[in-house]
């Protein structure tokens, strides 16, 4: 389970309401850090182990997911054809 935590606000500039946000995720046994719907998430460790990245549903709703060659990451293809590539080190 993950929750978005607001870390701080820039109080020195009242007009700026931009807050720095981060995810805090508490994973269950058998889960490790991953990405679901373009957000940090806890995912089945076997997905990471086997590099079946698309199984963790990393792309936004309506986008298509494809594995990169050698399973080095994945691409998310938007309906308009724009492609976002994520590589895993």
């Amino acid at each position: 389970t993950c929750e978005i935590v607001t870390l701080d606000r820039d109080s020195s500039q009242p007009r700026r309401t931009i807050a720095r946000q981060t995810a805090r995720c508490a994973c269950r046994k058998g889960q490790i850090a991953g990405t679901t719907r373009a957000r940090p998430a806890c995912v089945d460790a076997r997905i990471i182990k086997t590099k079946q990245w698309c199984d963790m549903l990393p792309c936004l709703e309506g986008e298509g997911c494809d594995l990169l060659i050698n399973r080095s990451g994945w691409t998310c293809t938007q309906p308009g054809g724009r492609i976002k590539t994520t590589t895993v080190s």
């Epitope: 805090r24 508490a26 994973c27 046994k29 058998g30 490790i32 850090a33 460790a45």
Partner: antibody, heavy 129, light 103 residues
Framework: AVTLDESGGGLQTPGGALRLSCSAS????????MFWVRQAPGKGLEYVSE????????NYGSAVKGRATISRDNGQSTLYLQMNSLRAEDTGTYFC??????????????????????WGHGTEVIVSS | ALTQPSSVSANPGETAKITCSGG???YGWFQQKPGSALVTVIY???ERPSDIPSRFSGALSGSTNTLTITGVQAEDEADYYC???????????FGAGTTLTVL
Amino acid sequence: AVTLDESGGGLQTPGGALRLSCSASGFDFSSHGMFWVRQAPGKGLEYVSEITNDGSGTNYGSAVKGRATISRDNGQSTLYLQMNSLRAEDTGTYFCARSTYECPGGFSCWGDTGQIDAWGHGTEVIVSS
Amino acid sequence: ALTQPSSVSANPGETAKITCSGGVYSYGWFQQKPGSALVTVIYWDDERPSDIPSRFSGALSGSTNTLTITGVQAEDEADYYCGTEDISGTAGVFGAGTTLTVL
């Protein structure tokens, strides 16, 4: 190199208490789930306890549940095991072990017994009157 | 409880296989020689630490993991324990150990 160094063992009396320590070096201690595993003389390995990388989650084997407390100090890179109401059957060598997965910042992760990639040399505990 | 054979024997140069079943998530294999520290030879099903010889390998099939030692050597004689999570997925568990004898 990854090093795990246990201490705190020795001769204990039944009903007594002890605190084992495991000093870790050579890796980012705060990113790894950690374990205590024990081995009675001439016997096999027994799961004792584990703790998540950030210390928020703990788990215990049935033989020590209610008598043991696992904790960690990530600032000092040290793992602890407090054992109360000691029994003769607690006699054995206690090992500290690391789970290989490096949990990223913002995540709390459990280790996995099948992912143990490093062990300490162990500290011997003898419970006898 | 995990199931692993109590003993396995092989001649030098032969292949020795030790199986372990009954757990979930991932499996590891831990070597223990008399009077020596525990050594991980395989972790996360099939990963081998950099200082472990390539003759050691692990493979997962369903819920059974097999440790294979290809071209067994005399120094491989030891007790081998498998480790994983119990079937409930809530706690760790180890097999009773397999004694590998090199004939």
